[in-house]
Amino acid sequence: MMTGTIETTGNISAKKGGSVILQCHLSSTMAQVTQVNWEQHDHSLLAIRNAELGWHIYPAFKDRVAPGPGLGLTLQSLTMNDTGEYFCTYHTYPDGTYRGRIFLEVLESSVAEHSARFQIP
């Protein structure tokens, strides 16, 4: 039975040219996380973090995507095209798959701030 829940940074905004942390956190389960996949709004896979084999970033994003903190993902040099949905998929054993959603809005305005609901140390 799947008892866990995914908390995410929810709806966030950041300014063009800046950076943002996408963060998901799986709680209320003792399941082992075997792999975390980070997908963009168009179903393209940005990154994988495999428990044994580490982080893998798709080459097209290598200059703008950094692994971490933790199981999260940092997007850098943001453009307006980065606006949209992002999904974290947690593959766990024995529970199965958990999925979280984050909406990122990239703003032209210099007053845009990135405020996450929580931060994983």
Epitope: Q35, L45, Y58, H91
Partner: antibody, heavy 117, light 106 residues
Framework: EVQLVQSGAEVKKPGASVKVSCKAS????????IYWVRQAPGQRLEIMGR????????YYVDKFKNRATLTADTSASTAYMELSSLRSEDTAVYFC??????????WGQGTLVTVSS | DIQLTQSPSFLSASVGDRVTITCKGS??????LVWYQQKPGKAPKLLIY???NLQSGIPSRFSGSGSGTEYTLTISSLQPEDFATYFC????????FGQGTKVEIK
Amino acid sequence: EVQLVQSGAEVKKPGASVKVSCKASGYTFTEYSIYWVRQAPGQRLEIMGRIDPKNGRTYYVDKFKNRATLTADTSASTAYMELSSLRSEDTAVYFCTRIYGFYFDFWGQGTLVTVSS
Amino acid sequence: DIQLTQSPSFLSASVGDRVTITCKGSQNVNKYLVWYQQKPGKAPKLLIYNTDNLQSGIPSRFSGSGSGTEYTLTISSLQPEDFATYFCYQYNNGFTFGQGTKVEIK
């Protein structure tokens, strides 16, 4: 043209070690991780581990953590896989392969390692 | 990790035949599926990535399709150089390979 060229076949006694090399050309060696994958007779391909030549960082599948050692010589654009305490079930073809993001795009030709007393 | 099962394991066909190989996952593969061709004593060759994207330089007679847990590799008209072993690989959950399908001359 991207190429991965591996060392030749080896015959080893049980308990011995083997070291297989993989020379890369046609791309910047430090930009892509190298994986080592093996295929025992009649078995499916099995991942052993990964090395990032840029920083020498290694990752091993649990099964091979204590027996496999992956290294890389960036000056020679060559990756190495050493497997110790060989047993008959280690008889297999060993491949090095470059990972492009999440899948393997270029492979070495394979090195047959036979473990026999 | 997802287990991949290919069918059939062996296939006898003639030049010009249309050939279909199936790869089934124990869980949803989410289209993160790749096909390789391997000939004896040679390096595996990447044919198709992300279910249906043909790798550069691969003839258009090769195509891939599928979703969820079921994926297929189709060779529209088998050529003499296509007799080989084909295997699938997934990276949606773990990095795992199918057991291979050997395509032999009938």
